[in-house]
């Protein structure tokens, strides 16, 4: 007698960060033969899907056509085989962006620095928010939190070439409602490659990491399909 079913995977396409009024699809992947999938939002049943035919489908999609702050929050999904339900998936934090205002991102001493220099990013937003988020675009979009009345500091410490890349920041009105993104700031780090080749990727962002998403400036926020399992630490919890 089967007593447990593996928990399903949950993710958002194209991304967990969704501009307001844009569409997003929440995907839930369980097992072939699953009779029913349930999507739960903030602990309550949000939607149900029954794949047809169950034996040929192991993934369902829940479409949100018009993202807004009421739809932002924590989602999880479960599925059943017969009358046996799986464990719930990990929580997916769906964030609505492009709310209210646009912060300004600046970097000190400047966007071109030498390896070993101390670098600090400043994210400023004059409206009522006290939490700021700094994201580095790339294979794993690292997120760092900062706090301040109208401005947050993000000290990177002595930088290496691993810090090279494009950064954006957001103001956060609550855990799941973020501002428009700032204009991107490209950090260029020059220095001795030998000394930095063994440095871990983005060493200043060890605590808050989503190792799952690819951010691109042209198309907005894209999911990295090679790393789709939403397993990394969750900034919002």
């Amino acid at each position: 007698q089967q007593q447990t079913l593996p928990k399903p995977f949950i993710w958002a396409e194209p991304h967990f960060m969704v501009p307001k009024e844009k569409q997003v699809t929440i995907c839930c992947q369980g097992n072939y033969g699953a009779v029913e999938y349930q999507l739960h939002f903030e602990g309550s049943l949000f939607a149900v899907d029954r794949p047809k035919p169950p034996e040929r489908i192991n993934k369902v999609k829940f479409y949100i056509p018009d993202m807004n702050s009421r739809m932002a929050g924590q989602y999880s999904c479960i599925y059943r085989v017969g009358e046996l339900w799986s464990e719930p998936s990990n929580l997916l934090d769906l964030v609505v962006t492009e709310m209210y205002d646009t912060p300004t991102l600046s970097v000190h001493p400047g966007p071109e620095v030498i390896s070993g220099e101390k670098v600090t990013f400043y994210c400023r937003l004059d409206t009522a928010t006290s939490m700021f988020l700094l994201l580095k675009e790339g294979r794993s979009s690292h997120v760092q939190r900062g706090y301040g009345k109208v401005q947050a500091e993000f000290p990177l410490g002595p930088v290496t070439t691993a810090h090279r890349g494009t950064y954006r920041c957001f103001g956060s009105y609550n855990n799941h409602a973020w501002s428009f993104p700032s204009e991107p700031v490209k950090l260029l780090v020059t220095g001795d490659i030998e000394n930095t080749s063994l440095a871990p990727e983005d060493p200043t962002f060890p605590a808050d990491t989503w190792g799952t998403y690819l951010l691109t400036t042209e198309t907005g926020l894209q999911k990295d399909h090679a790393l789709w399992d939403h397993t990394a630490q969750n900034l919002l919890r």
Epitope: Q1, Q2, Q3, T4, L5, V35, E36, L45, R50, K52, P53, P54, E55, V81, G82, E83, L84, W85, E87, P88
Partner: antibody
Framework: QVQLVQSGAEVKKPGASVKVSCKAS????????MHWVRQAPGQGLEWIGY????????EYNQKFKDRTTITADKSTSTAYMELSSLRSEDTAVYYC??????????WGQGTLVTVSS | DIQMTQSPSSLSASVGDRVTITCRAS??????LAWFQQKPGKAPKLLVY???NLADGVPSRFSGSGSGTDYTLTISSLQPEDFATYYC?????????FGGGTKVEIK
Amino acid sequence: QVQLVQSGAEVKKPGASVKVSCKASGYTFTSFTMHWVRQAPGQGLEWIGYINPSSGYTEYNQKFKDRTTITADKSTSTAYMELSSLRSEDTAVYYCVRGSSRGFDYWGQGTLVTVSS
Amino acid sequence: DIQMTQSPSSLSASVGDRVTITCRASENIYSNLAWFQQKPGKAPKLLVYAATNLADGVPSRFSGSGSGTDYTLTISSLQPEDFATYYCQHFWGTPRTFGGGTKVEIK
């Protein structure tokens, strides 16, 4: 072995409430859903609803939704079904049933609830 | 709600007879169907799950078949202990619903 032991027969007046218990043993209580099914005298089977004891999530037959509450106590591996605003047509045997990957695989012995003025 | 229509509602048969009970769902239930046997004063007992799979300890003279909306329970050679009422039930959606039952009586 899996056992579902239900509370004893009840006689209730119309308008009253009844709470039937179902103590599970022989398996991990939180790994399986618990359903409730009733059977009026000489009639067929009618599904009332279920609870996932792990999460407390419940789902009900719309017919009973306003009058039924299904709960579970993980510490005692016991499920409960409470039916309120009883009427004579609620006279039935009420069964708790374990839900597994095979469907309704183990049933309690049944509890007769008689509603009579 | 999905309606389950079971037929016949009763039948008379002799020991050794082949007995067939059918169940029709009001929509495709994708083989999410179970069959139960119930004897007077007792709780139902699972015979078949997922339309065709025999539950543990159920004699091989019982078999289930069907797909889509139409399903059948067959008893290949009726035994004295098989005289009972049989129910089909779907577990495709909510609410789960049962057929009206088929009473198998001794001829």
